[in-house]
């Protein structure tokens, strides 16, 4: 039975040209995380495999940094980065857990930074 829950940064905003941390946290389960996929709509940004480590998709290599932890740092943000991001946790023996984050990249310097995992 899947007992775990994923806590995410939820809806967040950031300033164009800045950076943001996407963070998910899996709790309430003793299942082992075997791989975390970070995806944007149908695009794979990065994976972190428990054995093989991080692998960043080539098209994002210049703007995506692994971590902290199982999170993902997006850099040099553009307005086109606005949208849904998904953390997909593969676990044994539970199966797959998915968390959703909505990122809005703002032109102005009044981007709100209120999310739980957000860095200033």
């Amino acid at each position: 039975m899947m007992t775990g829950t994923i806590e995410t940064t939820g809806n967040i905003s950031a300033e164009k040209g800045g950076s943001i941390i996407l963070q998910c946290h899996l709790s309430s389960t003793t299942a082992q995380v075997t791989q975390v996929n970070w995806e944007q709509q149908d695009q794979l940004l990065a994976i972190c495999n428990a054995d093989l480590g991080w692998h960043i998709s080539p098209s994002f290599k210049d703007r995506v940094a692994p971590g902290p932890g199982l999170g993902l740092t997006l850099q040099s943000l553009t307005v086109n980065d606005t949208g849904e991001y998904f953390c997909i946790y593969h676990t044994y023996p539970d199966g797959t857990y998915t968390g959703r984050i909505f990122l809005e990249v703002l032109e102005s310097s009044v981007a709100e930074h209120g999310a739980r995992f957000q860095i200033p």
Epitope: N37, A50, D51, P58
Partner: antibody
Framework: QVQLVQSGAEVKKPGSSVKVSCKAS????????IEWVRQAPGQGLEWMGE????????NYNEKFKGRVTITADKSTSTAYMELSSLRSEDTAVYYC?????????WGQGTLVTVSS | DIVMTQSPDSLAVSLGERATINCSAS?????IHWYQQKPGQPPKLLIY???NLASGVPDRFSGSGSGTDFTLTISSLQAEDVAVYYC?????????FGGGTKLEIK
């Protein structure tokens, strides 16, 4: 359900090359590493290399570098392992396997026999 | 390369008895995986990350250990457990397997 189906047995001459295919189904091929492992008759398992199909990124066992090339075709969800300059000691069963929390699904194996 | 040494090479155990297979790494590793291979079949994931049973594996199988010394235990051997067992490390590339332990019924 997850399946990895490999190409059929091959008989090759020393010095030639062989290309083994591994067709994946039942999961999103581009999202997970595929590894290649071989097993000589009556022997143990030997890791050859791996590919992340989503990007084409590869890692190889230094022992095979220059002789092995691993590729993937996302459009057909197929991974390939090509081994060149074959010698008799390359006679083995070659396996592909998906990597998710260790090698959790394996192909059925492809016997490659190198003989003059 | 990290060398994984399994002992014994072969083991004969009576049905219902305990079977123990050892795996020793030439340098310290974080964890290992165990695979079971039956004749004419590909290997099958048995235990991942030292002690976690893979999906569908009976709980008579268990794994333990740390550092350089690891153990696979079958608490009560069944006829279907006859196979070759391999350990594998993912600590340092190239990923290496042990030489295998052939388990038979006495």
């Amino acid at each position: 359900q997850v399946q990895l189906v490999q190409s059929g047995a091959e008989v090759k001459k020393p010095g030639s090359s062989v290309k083994v295919s591994c067709k994946a189904s039942g999961y999103t091929f581009s999202r997970y590493w595929i590894e290649w492992v071989r097993q000589a008759p009556g022997q143990g398992l030997e890791w050859m290399g791996e590919i992340f199909p989503g990007s084409g990124g590869t890692n190889y066992n230094e022992k095979f570098k220059g002789r092995v090339t691993i590729t993937a075709d996302k459009s057909t969800s197929t991974a390939y392992m090509e081994l060149s300059s074959l010698r008799s000691e390359d006679t083995a069963v070659y396996y592909c396997a998906r990597h998710l929390g260790a090698l959790d699904y394996w192909g059925q194996g492809t016997l490659v026999t190198v003989s003059s | 390369d990290i060398v994984m040494t399994q002992s014994p090479d072969s083991l004969a155990v009576s049905l219902g008895e305990r079977a123990t297979i050892n795996c020793s790494a030439s340098s310290s590793v974080s964890y290992i995986h165990w695979y079971q291979q039956k004749p004419g079949q590909p290997p099958k994931l048995l235990i991942y990350r030292t002690s976690n049973l893979a999906s569908g594996v009976p709980d008579r199988f268990s794994g333990s250990g740390s550092g350089t010394d690891f153990t696979l235990t079958i608490s009560s051997l069944q006829a279907e457990d006859v196979a070759v067992y391999y350990c594998q490390q993912y600590h340092s590339n190239p990923w290496t397997f042990g030489g295998g332990t052939k388990l038979e019924i006495k």
